[in-house]
């Protein structure tokens, strides 16, 4: 992979340990927490990033209405189980044998149960709605310029193919970015929308995962775009299964 050969670091993931012990003395990087080898020419999977984050010292850490089946990540951080490809395992459990099923972005999609809980398959999150509120500005941003700037960002910074950015909506001060990627659309080598959304979320929070790159400096025709709140909704190919008790809470 194309980890920087001269100083052997991973440009796309600072939460790695790299050494020139790959074939032919090439730089090889492994994710913290899991020790799995990562491809530094692309984004690291969210599962490996969460695992690395949990292993790190604690101080290192026209608008669309989301559908009734949209999930928000209310559970926050946990130490996930990842499969050999770095994807989330469909069933996640904590140290007290409480288990639950997750989708492809690692968000819980069932009630919590015990070790007998079955999660037959990893359900794909095919639609992500990123809901942003920007800080007050003198005037509204030009919609087309804002739209293009965000699309450029996802292409250039996160290497997400433009076909997966379905829409950018803007009603000042709310911006919504819709990412869509069905299983059938995702080719080998394509960045996953869940990974792109996670990198973006961390960038927005000022917690960039990139090595040796400046933090995110979003500008629209030179005007700074400063985000003051972010909400991310996840829509799965199969609706989540929660009890009525949770839905009425």
């Amino acid at each position: 992979h194309t980890a920087a050969q001269d100083n052997c670091t991973c440009p796309t993931n600072k939460m790695t340990v790299c050494s020139p012990d790959g074939p032919g003395g090439r730089c090889q990087c492994r994710a913290l927490g899991s020790g799995m080898a990562v491809d530094c020419s692309t984004l690291t999977s969210k599962c490996l990033l969460l695992k690395a984050r949990m292993s790190a010292p604690k101080n290192a850490r026209t608008l669309v209405r989301p559908s009734e089946h949209a999930l928000v990540d209310n559970d926050g951080l946990y130490d996930p189980d990842c499969d050999p490809e770095g994807r989330f395992k469909a069933r996640q459990c904590n140290q007290t044998s409480v288990c639950w099923c997750v989708n492809s972005v690692g968000v819980r999609r069932t009630d919590k149960g015990d070790l007998s809980l079955r999660c037959d398959e990893l359900v794909r999150t095919h639609h992500i709605l990123i809901d942003l509120r920007h800080r007050p500005t003198a005037g509204a941003f030009n919609h087309s310029d804002l739209d293009a700037e965000l699309r450029r960002l996802f292409r250039e910074r996160y290497r997400l193919h433009p076909k997966f950015v379905a829409a950018v909506h803007y009603e000042q001060p709310t911006i919504q970015i819709e990412l869509r990627q069905n299983t059938s659309q995702k080719a080998a080598g394509d960045v996953d929308i869940g990974d792109a959304a996670y990198y973006f979320e961390r960038d927005i929070k000022g917690e960039s995962l990139f090595q040796g790159r400046g933090g995110l400096d979003l500008r629209v025709r030179g005007e700074p775009l400063q985000v003051e709140r972010t909400l991310i909704y996840y829509l799965d190919e199969i609706p989540p299964k929660f009890s009525m008790k949770r839905l009425t809470a």
Epitope: A4, A148, R155, E156, R159, K163, V191, G214
Partner: antibody, heavy 117, light 106 residues
């Protein structure tokens, strides 16, 4: 095979408009971006702007705002770039280029636009 | 706008020579792209993401650098390498190119 085939050379008078076409084949048109770049005789490359073919989102370089219009016809997989109020400095070869996770991966053969009275 | 300055603007070299072209950005960029252009032809993508060779590009070409300083190196010039080379960034709008480096036969 990915191909971008541009329209033929044009000779225009100052003040007129020119519309250059770029017909795409070998890929799903609406999945990509078409950028436009020009090159004056003996000079370097200058970016004009780009259009996202799936959404119609457009970004023009400040220098060309107000004079350039980019459009696309998805039924014929053709992108267009129209430049108005032409002046002699606009004499150049105009290229279309496909964008993906790269800014430009495939280029058209170029269209020479000559502005002369 | 991010300005890209290439040096040298032109250079004469012989077949078999090692050649280095530099590109300096006026502010930090994530990656650099390099294109090769031959007279009367469209530019061709040579190197992307600073150091990765585009499909079909010979291994004598290499790219390196980070931040504001980037280089394109041709380890052993071949007759077909005499052309003009451009660096380009897209870390922010507008996308910009270097002024070009014309590589001529000595």
């Amino acid at each position: 095979e990915v191909q971008l085939v541009q329209s033929g050379p044009e000779v225009k008078k100052p003040g007129a408009s020119v519309k250059v076409s770029c017909k795409a084949s070998g890929f799903t048109f609406t999945d990509y971006v078409i950028g436009w770049v020009r090159q004056a005789p003996g000079q370097g490359l200058e970016w004009i702007g780009e259009i996202y073919l799936g959404s119609g989102t457009i970004y023009y370089a400040e220098k060309f705002k107000g004079r350039v219009t980019m459009t696309a016809d998805t039924s014929t997989s053709t992108a267009y770039m129209e430049l108005s109020s032409l002046r002699s400095e606009d004499t150049a070869v105009y290229y279309c280029a496909r964008g993906s996770i790269f800014p430009f991966d495939y280029w058209g053969q170029g269209t020479l636009v000559t502005v002369s009275s | 706008d991010i300005q890209l300055t290439q040096s040298p603007s032109s250079l004469s070299a012989s077949v078999g020579d090692r050649v280095t072209i530099t590109c300096r950005a006026s502010s930090s960029v994530s990656y650099m792209y390099w294109y090769q252009q031959k007279p009367g032809k469209a530019p061709k993508l040579l190197i992307y993401d600073t150091s990765t060779l585009a499909s079909g590009v010979p291994s004598r070409f290499s790219g390196s650098g980070s931040g504001t300083d980037f280089t394109l190196t041709i380890s052993s010039l071949q007759p077909e390498d005499f052309a003009t080379y451009y660096c380009q960034q897209w870390s922010s709008y507008p996308y910009t190119f270097g002024q070009g480096t014309k590589l001529e036969i000595k």
